[in-house]
Interface confidence: low
């Protein structure tokens, strides 16, 4: 008897569409309403323990009230119908909750996917969130069998994967129910043969052949997957050196139905390459299968495809009637080495006379010569044969060397340091650029690189540092041998100088004073000096500055308030900031020379 | 086979911030989505975050406004911003290339995981 309610709340359990109108009434019993002296007119409605305002009740008859709640924007509410008796005490008659969302969306996009050696699973779109339980069933059927439905779990709602067997080359139709509380929609039918929805698994066994006679080949071989008897399989080859991150690819028309090996041509040689391989049915209708496991396999060699850079350096102190000479070269990179490199070959011709022939295994080889003029030549050898020959000419000691490049220039650019300038009219058959780090600590050791003749714009290969001075020289050479060098100074990046310059007095008089300092020392400058600052001042004055161009040692202050301590520090700038040198003070006499009292 | 190489992982207070990597050399996240997922010891592995090949992202009730997943399309690198980190964030994070839809199966190499980097929030 305790537990029978005062009345009740109908609908019981309501589920209504989010942004609809709402209608609840509350009746209450009879022995209710006599028990505590009270009827509709008592009646207030709560949601979620707030109380909802008297303009939203009607008053049906002296047992029911209702209440309307229009464009419901909770997803749920608690609704309670209570009364006031004795005293204003509320007391709880029923309550309900209302719950809203939306219908179902038609299901769209859907689509299907059979992997090879599996059962077909399609997924679809399911629209927008209802906010309530939707389930969804994949329903499909041949025109002769219907099959058995395929409810979505409730963690993968817009995907299932059916029960039965593929069977290929039946015609099968398939489509997507969804429904909630709120309605059901059904997605468009599609109709097609599981055929055209595989996805094989990827070809295996994937391996590379090298072969001796060609260093641009490698030959795949493979083994396709089992659905190669149902279907005619394409493929897609990709490669990529082993160092690349980026992959090429075959040709598609090349691999364009079943086969179990593929020629891949255009390698370079003496190269590691990886391989990978994917395949689908050949129409083009279906997945591509996933990409095979990676295989890797190594050009065969070839003969170096390029003559290295070469050059030559004289010792200036020479003995009568000989010179020392060094001949360097530089070693080529693996793409033009093509191979393990074995050794160098020089040969060295005096003029018009007998030739010696040299074997080397370094990069570099001093011999004595004697004033005359010598052509050098070098090759470079492997295991499959020699490079052609790189050319030099090196003139005879009274030599003089002429039309140097024209307009050299030097400038840092996307953190490289690049030199350009004019080419001579002259033919230029290569360019040799040099490089050191100028320092007042160290000697200027060089570096160097050989350019073609058709070049006049180029950047340093080198690991260049920041902030340091590099002076840089460009050598035209011609047939007859080297040009005239033209140098230039550059830094890959400037900062301020580390030091500020010293300043001190040359000479002091009462009314001006001749400051000097000492240029910076190269190591700390960092850049190049642009100009100077001078800042003076009294003890008790404002800083006065002057500017100095960067050429100046010296400068005279002038107006000076005689028998008074000046204070006075000087900054140096390049382009990126300055950098102040110690302070220094000195004071200027009370009369001037000869001057009395 | 993708190579998914996830960076970043540590320990960190309460309160602090990590930002995880997820890098996919020869791996185009242009074509493709990322999941980040993390498994806590003794625990199921729970997906935390992803981005979609035209950069939609979502995330887990448990992480939301205090994860941001984003991706650099230039670096094949899909980045998990990590602010407000609790105790309970504490756990292995794997990436995993994105299945998407079937309509873009074709273009991903789809389904591959990383090794996972740990992270550590201690309270």
């Known amino acids: 008897e305790l537990l029978d309610p005062c009345g009740y709340i109908s609908p019981e359990s309501p589920v209504v569409q989010l942004h609809s109108n709402f209608t609840a009434v509350c009746v209450l019993k009879e022995k209710c309403m006599d028990y505590f002296h009270v009827n509709a007119n008592y009646i207030v409605w709560k949601t979620n323990h707030f109380t909802i305002p008297k303009e939203q009740y009607t008053i049906i008859n002296r047992t029911a009230s209702s209440v309307t709640f229009t464009d419901i924007a909770s997803l749920n509410i608690q609704l309670t119908c209570n009364i006031l008796t004795f005293g204003q005490l509320e007391q709880n008659v029923y309550g309900i909750t209302i719950i809203s969302g939306l219908p179902p969306e038609k299901p769209k996009n859907l689509s299907c996917i059979v992997n090879e050696g599996k059962k077909m699973r399609c997924e679809w779109d399911g629209g927008r969130e209802t906010h309530l339980e939707t389930n969804f069933t994949l329903k499909s059927e041949w025109a002769t069998h219907k099959f058995a439905d395929c409810k979505a779990k409730r963690d993968t709602p817009t995907s299932c994967t059916v029960d039965y067997s593929t069977v290929y080359f039946v015609n099968i139709e398939v489509w997507v129910e969804a429904e909630n509380a709120l309605g059901k929609v059904t997605s468009d039918h599609i109709n097609f043969d599981p055929v055209y929805k595989v996805k094989p698994n990827p070809p295996h066994n994937l391996s590379v052949i090298n072969s001796e006679e060609l260093s641009s080949i490698l030959k795949l071989t493979w083994t396709n997957p089992s659905i190669k008897s149902v279907i005619i399989l394409k493929y897609n080859i990709q490669y990529r050196t082993k160092d690349a991150s980026t992959w090429s690819q075959i040709p598609p028309e090349d691999t364009a139905s079943t086969r179990s090996s593929f020629t891949v041509q255009d390698l370079k040689p003496f190269t590691e390459y990886v391989f990978r391989i994917r395949c689908m049915k050949e129409d083009g209708k279906g997945y591509w299968s996933d990409w095979s496991e990676e295989a890797s396999g190594i050009t065969y060699e070839d003969r170096p495809s390029k003559a290295p850079s070469f050059w030559y350096k004289i010792d200036p102190s020479h003995t009568q009637g000989y010179r020392t000479v060094q001949l360097v070269w530089k070693t080529l990179p693996p793409f033009e080495a093509n191979g393990k490199i074995l050794d160098y070959e020089v040969t060295l011709t005096r003029w018009k006379s007998h030739l010696q022939n040299y074997t080397v295994n370094a990069t570099k080889l001093t011999v004595n010569l004697t004033n005359d003029r010598y052509l050098a030549t070098l090759t470079v050898r492997n295991l499959v044969g020699k490079s052609d020959a790189a050319v030099l000419t090196i003139p005879a000691c009274d030599f003089q060397a002429t039309h140097p490049v024209m307009d050299l220039k030097a400038f840092p650019k996307d953190n490289m340091l690049w030199v350009e300038w004019t080419t001579p009219r002259e033919s230029v058959k290569k360019y040799i650029l040099e490089w050191c780090v100028l320092s007042d600590k160290a000697p200027c050791i060089t570096d160097w690189q050989q350019e073609d003749g058709t070049v006049h714009r180029t950047y340093l290969r080198g690991n260049l540092a920041e902030s340091k001075c590099y002076l840089i020289t460009v050598t035209p050479v011609y047939a007859d041998g080297p040009g005239s060098p033209e140098s230039i100074k550059a830094y890959l990046k400037q900062a301020p100088p580390s030091k500020g310059p010293t300043v001190r007095t040359k000479k002091v008089g009462k009314n001006e004073a001749v400051l000097e300092w000492d240029q910076l020392p190269v190591d700390v400058q960092n850049g190049f000096i642009r100009n100077y600052t001078i800042f003076y001042r009294t003890i008790i004055g404002n800083e006065t500055a002057v500017n100095v161009d960067s050429s100046h040692t010296e400068y005279t202050l002038s107006s000076l308030t005689s028998d008074t301590l000046y204070m006075v520090r000087m900054a140096a700038y390049t382009d990126e900031g300055g950098k102040d040198g110690p302070e220094f003070t000195f004071t200027t006499p009370k009369f001037a020379q000869g001057e009395i009292e | 086979q993708v190579q998914l190489q996830e960076s970043g992982g540590g320990s960190v207070q309460a309160g602090g911030s990590l930002r995880l990597s997820c890098t996919a050399p020869?791996?185009?996240?242009?074509?493709?989505?990322m999941d980040w997922y993390r498994q806590a010891p003794g625990k199921e592995r729970e997906f935390v975050s992803s981005i979609s090949t035209d950069g939609t992202t979502g995330y887990a009730d448990s992480v939301k406004g205090r994860f941001t997943i984003s991706k650099d399309k230039a670096k094949d690198t899909v980045y998990l911003q990590m602010n407000s980190l609790k105790p309970e964030d504490t756990g292995m994070y794997s990436c995993k290339t994105k299945d998407g839809t079937i309509a873009t199966m074709e273009l991903c190499d789809f389904g591959y995981w990383g090794q996972g980097t740990q992270v550590t929030v201690s309270s």
């Open positions: 020869g791996f185009t996240s242009n074509s493709c989505g």
